[in-house]
């Protein structure tokens, strides 16, 4: 079944942008001016998820790349990774659970909770130039709030 998708950029609540760091990792850092063109453009898709009153299930792909953010166990710890997929089959309404994030929107701030690992969130560090990761704490040092901006093609 077709899915509703949009193209956007994400910035954390400290206004750090997300950029590629090697082929399979994202990092967060402050960008200005022309450097803003480095930021990753996501293709966010509305997918099937568990019933909830305040969470909207989405998948986060990298625009025009066959890469999706996914959540897997590595060394017994929930971990965020970029995973290659067959572009002929993605995005789809029924995404595998590791690709699904529950988007929680409060006062124009977005959180992305892993559907596979409840209470684990896409996170950035306070420090500059550090990897985007899956964090198990909210409201601590690490940043779990993001803002979204549409990208005009």
């Amino acid at each position: 079944a077709p899915v509703r998708s949009l193209n956007c950029t994400l910035r954390d609540s400290q206004q750090k942008s997300l950029v590629m760091s090697g082929p399979y990792e994202l990092k967060a850092l402050h960008l200005q001016g022309q450097d803003m063109e480095q930021q990753v453009v996501f293709s966010m898709s509305f997918v099937q998820g568990e019933e909830s009153n305040d969470k909207i299930p989405v998948a986060l792909g990298l625009k025009e790349k066959n890469l999706y953010l996914s959540c897997v166990l590595k060394d017994d710890k929930p971990t965020l990774q970029l995973e290659s997929v067959d572009p002929k089959n993605y995005p789809k309404k029924k995404m595998e659970k590791r690709f699904v994030f529950n988007k929680i929107e409060i006062n124009n701030k977005l959180e992305f909770e892993s559907a596979q690992f409840p209470n684990w969130y896409i996170s950035t560090s306070q420090a500059e130039n550090m990897p985007v990761f899956l964090g198990g704490t909210k409201g601590g040092q690490d940043i779990t709030d993001f803002t979204m901006q549409f990208v005009s093609s």
Epitope: R4, S5, E51, N53, K103, S152
Partner: antibody, heavy 119, light 108 residues
Framework: EVQLVESGGGLVQPGGSLRLSCTVS????????MSWVRQAPGKGLEWIGI???????YYASWAKGRFTISKDTSKNTLYLQMNSLRAEDTAVYFC?????????????WGQGTTVTVSS | EIVMTQSPSTLSASVGDRVIITCQAS??????LSWYQQKPGKAPKLLIY???TLASGVPSRFSGSGSGAEFTLTISSLQPDDFATYYC??????????FGQGTKLTVL
Amino acid sequence: EVQLVESGGGLVQPGGSLRLSCTVSGFSLSSYAMSWVRQAPGKGLEWIGIIYDSASTYYASWAKGRFTISKDTSKNTLYLQMNSLRAEDTAVYFCARERQIFSGDMDGWGQGTTVTVSS
Amino acid sequence: EIVMTQSPSTLSASVGDRVIITCQASQSIDNWLSWYQQKPGKAPKLLIYRASTLASGVPSRFSGSGSGAEFTLTISSLQPDDFATYYCQNTGGGVSIAFGQGTKLTVL
């Protein structure tokens, strides 16, 4: 305060075209999706389509081809281009804001602009 | 496309009555359903989203329930301001968003 104001309605002949505008304030089109919904006289609500970024628009099956939604974020303005208009397109046209991205529901509405298709 | 069917199409009731409006989807939409109230010459107003969550500023006499393909809107004790037309809306089935045909609530 969230405000949406439609304009551009009026009388148009069958086969003609019309472009409606919806100017918004109190929020940004760069982070909210917008729909167009219409209501024929004495009839129910009919969803036309929705726009996220300028490349991501979705339409009701009946609206594909004749209706095009676009926006100018710098002007905080949403548009509905209507072509090959027919008598059955006579309606009040509303713009509406999606409450949250992909929520589908609409928490802010304009007052509507009336389109009459008649010779 | 998913079709939304409301019943009844018209409903007459009195102030203080308990009123129930139903909405059926042609296939399961989980809890992706909203309800709106519209008064003549006015824009619709969001009442309930995700089947049961009250929108901001909506009185608690309104409630929604249901999941899958069957949904209800209940007004526990009808007030004079509640006479209006009510619409359900599928918000999550595929790429299309569809309204029911409406239920007109009139004074008995």
